[in-house]
């Protein structure tokens, strides 16, 4: 349905508060280096303009597209060339090329300082002094660091952030109340950002068919009682929502997400029995709840899949005449029966089924050719099952920190060209799969683990795309979305890699080590471990363990010394020499 003024339409649909929040997020995700005040000014100007269009949709410029309006506004920023360099060239383009250009310049790893959390009293004062500015600052700071954060979900995080301060700033022990809530929001926010980044990568790098396949599998697991037509409708709508958000169309995205939530709540009976508790909640909470809703129970007595997908005489005809529908139904039927499989495994099975039909249908006896197709799934299923089993055993044996270290060594040997900070970040996150998934019952382990790993490996792919250094990484990242994890798992020690020359500076430490938090100490040690492996890629586990144990002992000793800096200066070179000898 067309509207005379798109901006007026969205303002009316979303309301002023959400409109302003979303425009702020959009601008912050595009111009990640701009100061907060500049963005607030731009947002206020756009909001005032939107109000004039609400009052009179025929007013000047009200008929312009949102991309045109927002792009024109972004291009008024005075310091665009100095701050963003070639991104300023986007402003010379016309829509839709200009928006595409802005999208291409989004930086997944912006050079921004880490967010430092002030004292609780300072935060509470700022909250009470100007709540609106305080919350806008939150949206701005998160959005500029996470340029693909799912915008309507970020509004939900902001609402929770506000609620935490409203509650805790009145509590007797403000810190005890607030800090765990902020930690939870930070961790959930990072996870949410990474999950959305995979959705956007899926859409942008592999097209909407890849995203739709993912959505069919996931929604069929969640809503196994829903008919295929219902799942297909939800998939189409969800694809539109995420395409819009990933494309920077945040107002349309939020509006369509609200419509989807409304539709789901009005049609609960034909979707899932689990939606009830979500549908009583206010909009932002409702949408979040629906996205995170647990899997419904599987219908009893689902028939065997073999009848329609192996034994039927129409298999090849149905496949050839409408692959999207036929394979979509196959994926739906398989996924609703297997909440215990990861989405990526389900997609691999659908791909294998498709490949078998493509190979067999033109043959003299198609049925004989594809009769054993389900048997061919077995190794595909066993591979992630074994991987999860082995890694959970290793996690339980080592604990999180040492499990992360094992992964650091493993991945540095696979792709030693990747930068040390990236290897540390990615391996630490890969290592978190243990605590997240290994405690779960068997039936939930694989979907938890493999789909989480897909999200983490996407982060590696996104960072690597910005600065490509390894053909192996490029190959695993670009060849097949569903086979990324198996591709990385299959990588071996890179024999072609020329070991990094030893640099004593890399292994020189100072007394500031002692004041670091436990997490920061771990990152320092893990950075050293990666550098060790880059220097000696063929070092054994035992050799590396010895060096790391010595390192921990050396740091502990110097941090207990009276003159810490003197101790580091004296013991450091000894540690370096001993390490070199141990690894010779």
């Amino acid at each position: 349905d067309t509207h005379k003024s798109e901006v007026a339409h969205r303002f009316k649909d979303l309301g002023e508060e959400h409109f302003k929040g979303l425009v702020l997020v959009a601008f912050s995700q595009y111009l990640q280096q701009c100061p907060f005040e500049e963005h607030v000014k731009l947002v206020n100007e756009v909001t005032e303009f939107a109000k004039t269009c609400v009052a009179d949709e025929s007013a000047e410029n009200c008929d312009k597209s949102l991309h045109t309006l927002f792009g024109d506004k972004l291009c008024t920023v005075a310091t665009l060339r100095e701050t963003y360099g070639e991104m300023a060239d986007c402003c010379a383009k016309q829509e839709p090329e200009r928006n595409e250009c802005f999208l291409q310049h989004k930086d997944d790893n912006p050079n921004l300082p880490p967010l430092v959390r002030p004292e609780v009293d300072v935060m509470c004062t700022a909250f009470h002094d100007n709540e609106a500015t305080f919350l806008k600052k939150y949206l701005y700071e998160v959005a500029r660091r996470h340029p693909y954060f799912y915008a309507p979900e970020l509004l939900f995080f902001a609402a929770r952030y506000k609620a935490a301060f409203a509650e805790c700033c009145q509590a007797a022990d403000k810190a005890a109340c607030l800090l765990p809530k902020l930690d939870e929001l930070r961790d959930e926010g990072k996870a949410s950002s990474a999950k959305q980044r995979l959705k956007c990568a899926s859409l942008q790098k592999f097209g909407d068919r890849a995203f739709k396949a993912w959505a069919v599998a996931r929604l069929s697991q969640k809503f196994p009682k829903a008919e295929f037509a219902e799942v297909s409708k939800l998939v189409t709508d969800l694809t539109k929502v995420h395409t819009e958000c990933c494309h920077g169309d945040l107002l349309e995205c939020a509006d369509d997400r609200a419509d989807l939530a409304k539709y789901m709540c009005e049609n609960q009976d034909s979707i899932s029995s689990k939606l009830k508790e979500c549908c009583d909640k206010p909009l932002l909470e409702k949408s979040h709840c629906l996205a995170e809703v647990e899997n419904d129970e599987m219908p009893a007595d689902l028939p065997s899949l073999a009848a329609d997908y192996v034994e039927s005489k129409d298999v090849c005809k149905n496949y050839a005449e409408a692959k999207d529908v036929f394979l979509g139904m196959f994926l739906y039927e398989y996924a609703r029966r297997h909440p215990d499989y990861s989405v990526m495994l389900l997609l691999r099975l659908a791909k294998a089924y498709e490949a078998t039909l493509e190979k067999c249908c033109a043959a003299a006896d198609p049925h004989e050719c594809y009769a054993k197709v389900f048997d061919e799934f077995q190794p595909l299923v066993e591979e992630p099952q074994n991987l999860v089993k082995q890694n959970c055993e290793l996690f339980e044996q080592l604990g999180e920190y040492k499990f992360q270290n094992a992964l650091l060594v493993r991945y540095t040997k696979k792709v030693p060209q990747v930068s040390t900070p990236t290897l540390v970040e990615v391996s630490r996150n890969l290592g978190k799969v243990g605590a997240k998934c290994c405690k779960l019952p068997e039936a939930k382990r694989m979907p938890c683990a493999e789909d989480y790993l897909s999200v983490v490996l996407n982060r590696l792919c996104v960072l690597h795309e910005k600065t490509p250094v390894s053909e192996k990484v490029t190959k695993c990242c670009t060849e097949s979305l569903v086979n990324r994890r198996p591709c990385f798992s299959a990588l071996e020690l890179d024999e072609a890699y020329v070991p990094k020359a030893f640099n004593a500076e890399t292994f020189t430490f100072h007394a500031d080590m002692c004041t670091l938090s436990e997490k920061e100490k771990q990152v320092k040690k893990q950075t050293a471990l990666v550098e060790l492996v880059k220097h000696k890629p063929k070092a054994t586990k035992e050799q590396l363990k010895g060096v790391m144990d010595n390192f921990a002992a050396f740091v502990e000793k110097c941090c207990k010394a009276d003159d810490k800096e003197a101790c580091f200066a004296e013991e450091g070179p000894k540690f370096v020499a001993a390490s070199q000898a141990a690894l010779a």
Partner: antibody
Framework: EVQLLESGGGLVQPGGSLRLSCAVS????????INWVRQAPGKCLEWIGI???????FYATWAKGRFTISRDNSKNTVYLQMNSLRAEDTAVYYC???????????????WGQGTLVTVSS | DIQMTQSPSSVSASVGDRVTITCQSS???????LSWYQQKPGKAPKLLIY???KLTSGVPSRFSGSGSGTDFTLTISSLQPEDFATYYC???????????FGCGTKVEIK
């Protein structure tokens, strides 16, 4: 050497019918899918349809109803029956084998030399 | 309706030149079901590339294909005298009945 050889082309009046043959030598036709593709003078290639080894057929939307593909494995030959011919059906008609291991992909590795069909009064 | 648009419709080039031909499909092809053919006057087409980037055996390595989804490219890195011909792309879709060819790009001597 594998060869596909089309025959049966010629001049036909509008509204008339024609049956083209594609004789295959050097391979056992019963294991392969064969397509018919046409090319009007100086124009694009146009896919007409396919017959799988099992005998199942599929046609381009525009070809359904007027065109029929069949095969006789004992003669190692595939046929294209064309009815209600029109001037715009004037073209060189080729038969082509789908690359083994594919069923629905547009990968045709062996082609005949083509036979010209002219529809004119 | 399926659209397979090739550009340019013709290109004049010299021996040794790098030639790039593009093929745009709407909607996107199924699973990279895209092929490239070479056709010389009075002859049948010859399959050069399948699955968007895989070279048919016997085809010289100066030919390469790339792309996915809706946008595809055929590149001849260094044009040889025997490469002057018309090149067609072919696409496969969700329904086999939608199999479509582009209308060709004629590579002629400058």
């Amino acid at each position: 050497e594998v060869q596909l050889l089309e025959s049966g082309g010629g001049l036909v009046q509008p509204g008339g019918s024609l049956r083209l043959s594609c004789a295959v030598s050097g391979i056992d036709l019963s294991n392969y899918a064969i397509n018919w593709v046409r090319q009007a003078p100086g124009k694009c290639l146009e896919w007409i349809g396919i017959i799988w080894a099992s005998g199942t057929t599929f046609y381009a939307t525009w070809a359904k109803g007027r065109f029929t593909i069949s095969r006789d494995n004992s003669k190692n030959t595939v046929y294209l029956q064309m009815n209600s011919l029109r001037a715009e059906d004037t073209a060189v008609y080729y038969c082509a084998r789908t690359v083994p291991g594919y069923s629905t992909a547009p990968y045709f590795d062996l082609w005949g030399q083509g036979t010209l069909v002219t529809v004119s009064s | 309706d399926i659209q397979m648009t090739q550009s340019p419709s013709s290109v004049s080039a010299s021996v040794g030149d790098r030639v790039t031909i593009t093929c745009q499909s709407s909607p996107s092809v199924w699973s990279n079901f895209l092929s490239w053919y070479q056709q010389k006057p009075g002859k049948a087409p010859k399959l050069l590339i399948y699955e968007a980037s895989k070279l048919t055996s016997g085809v010289p390595s100066r030919f390469s294909g790339s792309g996915s989804g809706t946008d595809f490219t055929l590149t001849i890195s260094s044009l040889q005298p025997e490469d002057f011909a018309t090149y067609y792309c072919g696409g496969g879709y969700s329904s086999i009945s939608d199999t479509t060819f582009g209308c060709g790009t004629k590579v002629e001597i400058k």
